[in-house]
Interface confidence: low
């Protein structure tokens, strides 16, 4: 992926819109489209003040780990969806899009250098608090987490990483 493609805000905006659309669709289905089990996902809440006070390496860890956890969660929901006869087939399209989107975002962030920043220097990773997680038991919750993660930590991180690259 071109190194600074994600710095074009329209790119991230496209994924955010897809996530919001999926969230809206799943809001309308029975019980939020139950997954039948709890899937671990990152806590997307951003305390802006704390975020600004912690170093870039810590941000990178939170974003990289969050993206990995979200990817696992979306793949798990994809598997659950494939084995379920109770969930509408139209949802499969949104889950597939999200799986594909998370893969693309991972590549774009890797190109931006988030992976290197997340593992070096080692102090950044070791001093970072363990990633806070929550449980999602419906597709609606899962897509809300996905949407909030993109609009929150990912948007904040790419903003500062792209600005650093501009200097």
């Amino acid at each position: 992926a071109p190194a600074r493609l994600i710095c074009d805000s329209r790119v991230l905006e496209r994924y955010i819109l897809e996530a919001k659309e999926a969230e809206n669709v799943t809001m309308g289905c029975a019980e939020g489209c139950s997954l039948g089990e709890n899937i671990t996902v990152p806590d997307t809440k951003v305390n802006f003040h704390h975020w600004k006070k912690s170093e870039a390496g810590r941000h990178a860890v939170e974003v990289w780990q969050g993206l990995a956890l979200l990817s696992e969660a979306m793949l798990r929901s994809q598997a659950l969806l494939a084995n379920s006869s109770q969930l509408p087939e139209t949802l499969q399209v949104h889950v597939d899009k999200a799986v594909s989107g998370l893969r693309s975002l991972t590549s774009l962030l890797r190109a931006l250098g988030v992976q290197k920043e997340a593992v070096s220097p080692p102090e950044a990773a070791s001093s970072a608090a363990p990633l806070r997680t929550v449980a999602a038991d419906t597709l609606c919750k899962l897509f809300r987490i996905y949407s909030n993660f993109l609009r929150g930590k990912l948007k904040l991180y790419t903003g500062e990483a792209c600005r650093r690259g501009d200097r």
Partner: antibody, heavy 127, light 108 residues
Framework: QVQLQQSGPGLVKPSQTLSLTCAIS??????????WNWIRQSPSRGLEWLGV?????????DYAVSVKSRITINPDTSKNQFSLQLNSVTPEDTAVYYC?????????????????WGRGTLVTVSS | SYVLTQPPSVSVAPGKTARITCSGD??????VEWYQQKPGQAPVLVIY???DRPSGIPERFSGSNSGNTATLTISRVEAGDEADYYC??????????FGGGTKLTVLG
């Protein structure tokens, strides 16, 4: 419904300290999901964020660079209020001062939005 | 320091659509809010998180944010929409986070 009631003098002499208080009802100053701000507005500077305090297992604050050396914002948990002190004021500090509540760690998407405001207090700095 | 730039004034006829812009370096990578302020009153939040409306704000108010520009769109403008509108962004708490404001005049 959150309500913010402001109080304090409307006239302060140059070089003295401007002191305002914001009493909170419908929420707690020690809330783990809210933040409490002071913002001012003048014809020359427009709307200007001054500073914030918030509680997340301990108290934190952030202040605007423009006033950092002169400002203090303190909570008063016993009265469920917070205060602004601005030292060494000059006529440039003449403005309408607002207290406001923002939500930096609660609902995703409302990380910074000032959803509730006090009515504002016009403070004139003049001898 | 981070600067948000707004046009000083925008005029629109009743029933038409008003668009107020707010520009800042790389603004699309931040959340943007919009506030409405009528004379003698405190500002009121009308849009947060680029495009979301707080409860009680009419659907006529919408927002977008991409590239270097955020836009507040007010469709089917009414006389009561006449006010000053301010954009704000949390680019940095330590910088001035408000735009200079735009006076919306409803013609007629």
């Amino acid at each position: 419904q959150v309500q913010l009631q402001q109080s304090g003098p409307g006239l302060v002499k140059p070089s003295q300290t401007l002191s305002l208080t914001c009493a909170i009802s419908g929420d707690s100053v020690s809330s783990n999901t809210a933040a409490w701000n002071w913002i001012r507005q003048s014809p020359s500077r427009g709307l200007e964020w001054l500073g914030v305090i918030y509680y997340r297992s301990k108290w934190y604050n952030d202040y605007a660079v423009s006033v950092k050396s002169r400002i203090t914002i303190n909570p008063d948990t016993s009265k469920n209020q917070f205060s602004l002190q601005l030292n060494s004021v000059t006529p440039e500090d003449t403005a309408v001062y607002y207290c406001a509540r923002s939500v930096p760690g609660g609902d995703p998407g409302l990380e910074h939005a000032f959803a509730y405001w006090g009515r504002g207090t016009l403070v004139t700095v003049s001898s | 320091s981070y600067v948000l730039t707004q046009p000083p004034s925008v005029s629109v006829a009743p029933g038409k659509t008003a668009r107020i812009t707010c520009s800042g370096d790389n603004l699309g990578t931040y959340y943007v809010e919009w506030y409405q302020q009528k004379p003698g009153q405190a500002p009121v939040l009308v849009i947060y998180d680029d495009s979301d409306r707080p409860s009680g704000i009419p659907e006529r108010f919408s927002g977008s944010n991409s590239g270097n520009t955020a836009t507040l769109t007010i469709s089917r403008v009414e006389a009561g929409d006449e006010a000053d509108y301010y954009c704000a962004s949390f680019a940095s708490w330590s910088d001035s986070v408000f735009g200079g404001g735009t006076k919306l005049t409803v013609l007629g």
